[in-house]
């Protein structure tokens, strides 16, 4: 059960989807990818305050235990709940091929 | 592809399964759970250095971009890769029932 979407820390501070522009060089892909030359990387960034977008029961437990033992148990973390696929034109030993990656771009986010 | 399991930060410092003992009171469950009275909560704790247990391509991208833009892009985070189910004996309006939760205890961990 995804819990509340209201961010108590202020607009844009809590776990949400961000887009970061990255070149092949930034990603360390220049030696094996031809296209795209630049990727709009969607990723999950932001804080996970109590019960904000809690992914499941485990996330709720983590929130409770973090409140009790903050030095031992970390707060839940903002991670992808699902992904958007992306095609890469990549170099092979003999030339190029198209390869679709299902786990490259975050589609939406939750706290876990 | 789960990447290297060697922790460059020293034994036990990187993302792995930990067990934290918690009472029903700790978990905020005392008003709706009868048993167990104490839970051995398995959770994922630890650092995610470069390519350590990278869950997927997204995690690898995150590592690369964190290295470039540490103030903008956080490092990958240690989260459950899978879960162990657990049964709770819980209070109902009329008595008790058994309920199995599939997403309560972490089974193993990765970085994402």
């Amino acid at each position: 059960a995804r819990n509340g979407d209201h961010c108590p820390l202020g607009p844009g501070r809590c776990c949400r989807l961000h887009t970061v522009r990255a070149s092949l060089e930034d990603l360390g892909w220049a030696d094996w990818v031809l296209s795209p030359r630049e990727v709009q990387v969607t990723m999950c960034i932001g804080a996970c305050p109590s019960q904000f977008r809690a992914a499941n029961m485990h996330a709720q437990i983590k929130t409770s235990l973090h409140r009790l033992k903050p030095d031992t148990v970390p707060a839940p973390c903002c991670v992808p709940a699902s992904y958007n696929p992306m095609v890469l034109i990549q170099k092979t030993d003999t030339g190029v091929s198209l390869q679709t990656y299902d786990d490259l771009l975050a589609k939406d986010c939750h706290c876990i | 592809a789960r990447n290297g399991d060697h922790c460059p930060l020293g034994p036990g410092r990187c993302c792995r399964l930990h067990t934290v003992r918690a009472s029903l009171e700790d978990l905020g469950w005392a008003d709706w759970v009868l048993s167990p009275r104490e839970v051995q909560v398995t959770m994922c704790i630890g650092a995610c250095p470069s390519q350590f247990r990278a869950a997927n391509m997204h995690a690898q991208i995150k590592t690369s971009l964190h290295r470039l833009k540490p103030d903008t892009v956080p490092a990958p985070c240690c989260v459950p890769a899978s879960y162990n189910p657990m049964v709770l004996i819980q209070k109902t309006d009329t008595g008790v029932s058994l309920q199995t939760y599939d997403d309560l205890l972490a089974k193993d961990c990765h970085c994402i």
Epitope: S35, L88, I89 | -
Partner: antibody, heavy 118, light 106 residues
Framework: QVQLQESGPGLVKPSETLSLTCTFS??????????VGWIRQPPGKGLEWLAH???????RYNPALKSRLTISKDTSKSQISLKLSSVTAADTAVYYC??????????WGQGTTVTVSS | DIQMTQSPSSLSASVGDRVTITCKAS??????VAWYQQKPGQSPKALIY???YRYSGVPSRFSGSGSGTDFTLTISSLQPEDFATYYC????????FGQGTRLEIK
Amino acid sequence: QVQLQESGPGLVKPSETLSLTCTFSGFSLSTSGMGVGWIRQPPGKGLEWLAHIRWDDVKRYNPALKSRLTISKDTSKSQISLKLSSVTAADTAVYYCAQMAWDWFAYWGQGTTVTVSS
Amino acid sequence: DIQMTQSPSSLSASVGDRVTITCKASQNVDTDVAWYQQKPGQSPKALIYSASYRYSGVPSRFSGSGSGTDFTLTISSLQPEDFATYYCHQYNSYPTFGQGTRLEIK
């Protein structure tokens, strides 16, 4: 494997609107980087790009034909439509749709022949 | 728009010959050039991407080179199935094709 199949009326009268459909399988237009383009080939001549549509719904048209072209997609049906208005005999051609990966026409359909005649 | 000028427009060659087709862009297109093969009654088939990279499944006798404005497609040793029309294509700006080179049996 990737497959694209063009369908059209075969014969269209001058001044009418030509409607073409491309039905594809083996890839998804929800995938970042994917698109579908339309290219035509008049009898005995070379290839002319008409339009394409991308995963993010960005549409591009050949500037020389832009006022007459409309491209659209139905991702759920894996179909792309192209409409060409006010046709003349010069629009007689084989019309191809092609899978695009980052602006490259990687795989082409077999084509559908369209004749403009009264 | 960017014009792609292919030469020759047609050429005759024999099985085993080495053949080179050239394509000149009217302005710099970096390496954003592809090559296609089309046999009579068939649709075009991708051969080369990014000026010099063979598409998967394309025989190694096909090679591409060039950058900027001048590009070549070379077939190192012609096979009977290679007689076809070849097109260059730039995708640096909105797509344009060369007029084609028809390769015939001598």
